[in-house]
């Protein structure tokens, strides 16, 4: 703007105005007249850059005229009133409406005063995120998918995770002309450690007040990972019964547990109770390798544990308690 005291009339308008596809938008434009300055406005004109002629004119004696009367309207200019507000409303915004517009006041005696306004036509995208359920492949595969549908301009998609991973983003035209659908895949080598973890898809767009965050819970299908717990190498004759647990991680959940030994079926002192194995007291030393075989929809895996029951002073053991 000119410095105060120059006595000049100035057209005030934002340099850029956003509007949404299909909606209406007002292009604001005002004449600022210094206190002591006399000015007379005889005409308001709107023109689009690169096009001949005016799209909207408000003449002090003839009133308004429009190139498209159903889509344009002076919001404040009235016959018989001082013309100080040239703000123009546009209805049914189209992609092709995006561009530079000039708002011009014909003032006397100051002359023509104008300002340029850039109209941005936006479309607010719809965002979704979903898991891509995978099995152990040994190679990078898409594990999550984030889609921003029908944005203008295209949305920006980024992924946030402490698991690493690489994005693969692509764009295709949206359903509405001038819009874009952005798809981003989050790619990683699947592992059981990743199953159940979260990754976040962040979608940024001019139409959002703040970025949209969509969380995806990862799913990796894998066969059981098996271990046996409950044995501390300190079992002695004459102790009470003890319990071994077959610990299995898998997706989907295990469907069955089977206990055996390397010699075949379980000995009489070992009783299977699902994922647990009850070891009853014995009266002679043993050295047996126990096997827990766990099954899920993807297969079976097993773990082995060699158990020794030794002779020794009851007071010194730390395993199973004496009667």
């Amino acid at each position: 703007w000119p410095p105060p005291g120059t006595g000049d009339v100035v057209v005030q308008a934002p340099t850029q105005v956003p509007g949404f596809l299909g909606d209406s938008v007002t292009l604001p434009c005002y004449l600022q007249v210094p206190n002591m300055e006399v000015t007379h406005v005889s005409q308001l004109t709107w023109a689009r850059h690169g096009e001949s002629g005016s799209m909207a004119v408000f003449h002090q004696t003839q009133g308004p005229s429009y190139s498209e009367s159903k889509r344009l309207e002076f919001v404040a200019a009235r016959l018989g009133a001082e013309l100080r507000n040239a703000s123009l409303r546009m209805f049914g915004l189209r992609v092709e409406d995006e561009g530079n517009y000039t708002c011009l006041f014909v003032t006397f005696p100051q002359g023509s005063r104008s300002v340029d306004i850039w109209l941005r036509v936006l479309a607010k995208p719809q965002n979704t995120a979903e898991v891509q359920k995978v099995q152990l492949t040994g190679e990078p595969v898409p594990m999550a998918r984030c889609v921003s549908t029908g944005g203008r301009p295209p949305a920006q998609i980024t992924w946030h995770s402490d698991l690493g991973g690489m994005p693969n983003t692509s764009q295709v035209p949206g359903f509405l002309s001038g819009t874009v659908t952005v798809t981003s895949l989050w790619i990683l080598v699947p592992s059981s450690q990743v199953d159940g973890k979260n990754v976040t898809c962040k979608v940024e767009h001019e139409s959002f007040e703040k970025p949209q965050l969509l969380t995806v819970n990862l799913t990796v299908y894998y066969p059981p990972e098996v271990s046996i717990s409950g044995y501390d190498n300190n079992w002695y004759l004459g102790q009470n019964e003890a319990t071994l647990t077959c610990d299995a991680r898998s997706n989907p959940e295990p469907t069955g547990y089977n206990w055996s030994t390397t010699m075949g079926p379980l000995p009489p002192f070992a009783v299977a109770q699902g994922a647990q194995l009850l070891i009853r007291p014995v009266d002679k030393p043993i050295n047996t390798t126990l096997i827990c075989n766990v099954t899920n929809a993807l297969g079976a895996r097993q773990a082995e544990l060699t158990v020794q029951v030794k002779e020794g002073p009851p007071s010194e053991h730390s395993g199973i308690s004496r009667n």
């Epitope: 006595g7 006399v38 003449h59 002090q60 004696t61 014909v106 006397f108 005696p109 002359g111 023509s112």
Partner: antibody, heavy 121, light 109 residues
Framework: QVQLVQSGAEVKKPGASVKVSCKAS????????ISWVRQAPGQGLEWIAW????????NYNQKFTGRVTMTTDTSTSTAYMELRSLRSDDTAVYYC??????????????WGQGTTVTVSS | QAVVTQEPSLTVSPGGTVTLTCRSS?????????ANWVQQKPGQAFRGLIG???NRAPGVPARFSGSLLGDKAALTLSGAQPEDEAEYYC?????????FGGGTKLTVL
Amino acid sequence: QVQLVQSGAEVKKPGASVKVSCKASGYTFTSSYISWVRQAPGQGLEWIAWIYAGTGDTNYNQKFTGRVTMTTDTSTSTAYMELRSLRSDDTAVYYCARHGMTGRGWYFAVWGQGTTVTVSS
Amino acid sequence: QAVVTQEPSLTVSPGGTVTLTCRSSTGAVTTSNLANWVQQKPGQAFRGLIGHTNNRAPGVPARFSGSLLGDKAALTLSGAQPEDEAEYYCILWYSNKFVFGGGTKLTVL
């Protein structure tokens, strides 16, 4: 061709009124701004007022406020300037001038031939 | 009350260049003063030459140009012709009124 033709010379007594006319041709009268200017004998030019012909909106030099009235008749494309309570120092040649636009600014484009007003007892 | 001052008279040789200036009693002349220049030849009506400081009117020869020169408005005539001999008036706008300069009598000799 744009022309402004003014009414003939007037002789008035002090305290009387005078109404000078300025007939326009060759352009759209209702879209024009017309100024009135005077030049007293041996003096410089003095701006009196302007009028927007389309609406009759006016702006007067404060020196003349209350004594001068500018009007237009769009049916005859004529502008009028009436000066009341005439004094001897109102003796002058009165001009109408149409403002035209050049580039993005206005200029004093076309002038009438002038009307001599003599105030004498 | 603003006073607009011009050189009372100037002389230029045919083909020569001359600059007429227009000073304001209120300070520097700026574009907000919308400087206008008009010409009056003896026995003829006034004719507008320049509007808005530097916009030449249609039909006015390119040898006439308007500008701001320091703190004054200026009319420069480059390549003066005998028919340019006339009285030249500067007009400045002061927020709510026009004020005329006293005029410069230009002689082409």
